[in-house]
Amino acid sequence: DTHKSEVAHRFKDLGEEHFKGLVLVAFSQYLQQCPFEEHVKLVNEVTEFAKTCVADESAENCDKSLHTLFGDKLCTVATLRETYGEMADCCAKQEPERNECFLQHKDDNPNLPPLVRPEVDVMCTAFHDNEATFLKKYLYEVARRHPYFYAPELLFFAARYKAAFAECCQAADKAACLLPKLDELRDEGKASSAKQRLKCASLQKFGDRAFKAWAVARLSQKFPKAEFAEVSKLVTDLTKVHTECCHGDLLECADDRADLAKYMCENQDSISSKLKECCDKPLLEKSHCLAEVENDEMPADLPSLAADYVESKDVCKNYAEAKDVFLGMFLYEYARRHPDYSVMLLLRLAKAYEATLEKCCAAADPHECYAKVFDEFQPLVEEPQNLVKQNCELFEQLGEYKFQNALLVRYTKKVPQVSTPTLVEVSRNLGKVGAKCCKLPEAKRMPCAEDYLSVVLNRLCVLHEKTPVSEKVTKCCTESLVNRRPCFSALELDEAYVPKAFNAETFTFHADMCTLSEKEKQVKKQTALVELVKHKPKATKEQLKGVMDNFAAFVEKCCKADDKEACFAEEGPKFVAASQAALA
């Protein structure tokens, strides 16, 4: 499937609108600090060049690879050295090393100001004045803050963003119409970014075998009526799509994703009865819908797994003939029978099964050795079941905010070296598992909870990799992808940690606290809580609760005072002194 001009091929396949959007996303994810106007200029230049190649594929430079074309374009940025420092050294390299170099410099936590949402009227005016620029700005701002965002999915978000403004800017009450939609897009966008980041980490840190195993398990749960060979084909195609997107090959990724959606819709009968409603939708919506589709019903007549994987005299023969295929079939068969298990648990079971076969197929009596392999799965299954049960009980007892605080304390004690902003962000997100999953029926709780926790813990891992401070975090993040969550769960209080010296400045608050939103107030209080635990890692729950209750009372009192700043100045030191005494 070779083309004289790759850029012309992709331009024709994707169409001008998607081509321009994807190039803007690619450039924004690589050069995260560049101003919007600079990126728009580069995108326009690339687009004009692509059009010349469409007109004549033999024109000069049209035969160059996309990496070469895009890399050359990025390297024309005048301020590269001043803005990005050593990233400018990438431009001295040849492809493919240059692209690898750009990828390595993607920043998961770029030093960019938080996006502030202007007044609704201001946004609607901007939307009506120049819709194209308004939507490009959205792509740019999201892409530069989320350098691994799944690019074709970001085009779908942009389409929804456009639809929200088109509808709500004509509504009688613009704000009531628009703001909930923007909140939903923001929250879904953050979740989508984090999920994609785990896929890219899985591919980049653990290889495509790890990603394929994840995909076999997940797709087998979604499509339990599909044959193993069908699932394998989907897994191969999906792996290609995500490898491309994670590698910055966004045009190829979007094109291949569209092909995969087309294939799935043309072969619904062999995949799932749930695809029908997705397949009538336009491309971006269709691909999103297929990715999120609910699990099909399990076939009613699935036989016991034991016959093929425990009782058969040919287990070791079948395993030896094609190890990965045999394990893939085991994973497929187990996953399609267990939509109630998390993907990570299914992968742990496959890993345990593999370890047993490796040991037993070399033993004197292999069958005797592996006869009880399914019994060994029981503790692996019970561990996440118990964890979900205990944490949902705690969530129901405490509510979200206090549940987050319990996790903040728990994780700060485990890994106190991690920066306070990271501990606050990660623990707040871990705490959201309660509202997200605990209301679900029993059969959906574990897959919801554990697979969500894997996404959140991956965020901790990528932030920690940038500035490593804890050997424990490094160990849990790098040793095994499927055992990350159990690894973190098993961590205890870090006895080797030297408590942080007390700094009164950390616990000094001002009247601006009173004008903060409820969420911002929570973050302030939770930041203080982490600092308290870092100062007194052995403080009991009761001691910490007492201090936090006093803190809330102190803030509430001063925010009601006539002279708020004076109150904070007077009551603050008293609160600090009382807290130190309580924790002594």
Partner: nanobody, 124 residues
Framework: EVQLLESGGGLVQPGGSLRLSCAAS????????MVWVRQAPGKGLEWVSM????????YYADSVKGRFTISRDNSKNTLYLQMNSLRAEDTAVYYC?????????????????WGQGTLVTVSS
């Protein structure tokens, strides 16, 4: 390319036996469930038997249960159908096919590649 080649058909008396073989090539045989399907003269297609990838699960149409046995040898990429106690109504062209999708209870069965068939005639 995918190829399925049936053999072993012929003329046999009622009550007699035959063993059909199907040699597969052009795909990873062990990844697929396989079936035998038949077409009697002037009739539609009827599925006869299905076997799982490792051969431990087998399904039979009620009309052949207890008389026919399906098996496979993945090392030889070959599918078999042992037919005993043959009856006149078993006369048909027998095809082996690669399963595309299979829902036993829902009756949804699709096959994407077929052989050219082998004729079995049961007559005295």
């Amino acid at each position: 390319e995918v190829q399925l080649l049936e053999s072993g058909g012929g003329l046999v008396q009622p009550g007699g036996s035959l063993r059909l073989s199907c040699a597969a090539s052009g795909f990873t045989f062990s990844l697929y469930r396989m079936v035998w399907v038949r077409q009697a003269p002037g009739k539609g297609l009827e599925w006869v038997s299905m076997i799982s990838q490792f051969g431990n699960q087998t399904y039979y149409a009620d009309s052949v249960k207890g008389r026919f046995t399906i098996s496979r040898d993945n090392s030889k990429n070959t599918l078999y159908l042992q037919m005993n106690s043959l009856r006149a109504e078993d006369t048909a062209v027998y095809y082996c096919a690669k399963v595309r999708s299979w829902d036993q209870t829902g009756g949804r069965r699709t096959f994407d590649y077929w052989g050219q068939g082998t004729l079995v005639t049961v007559s005295s």
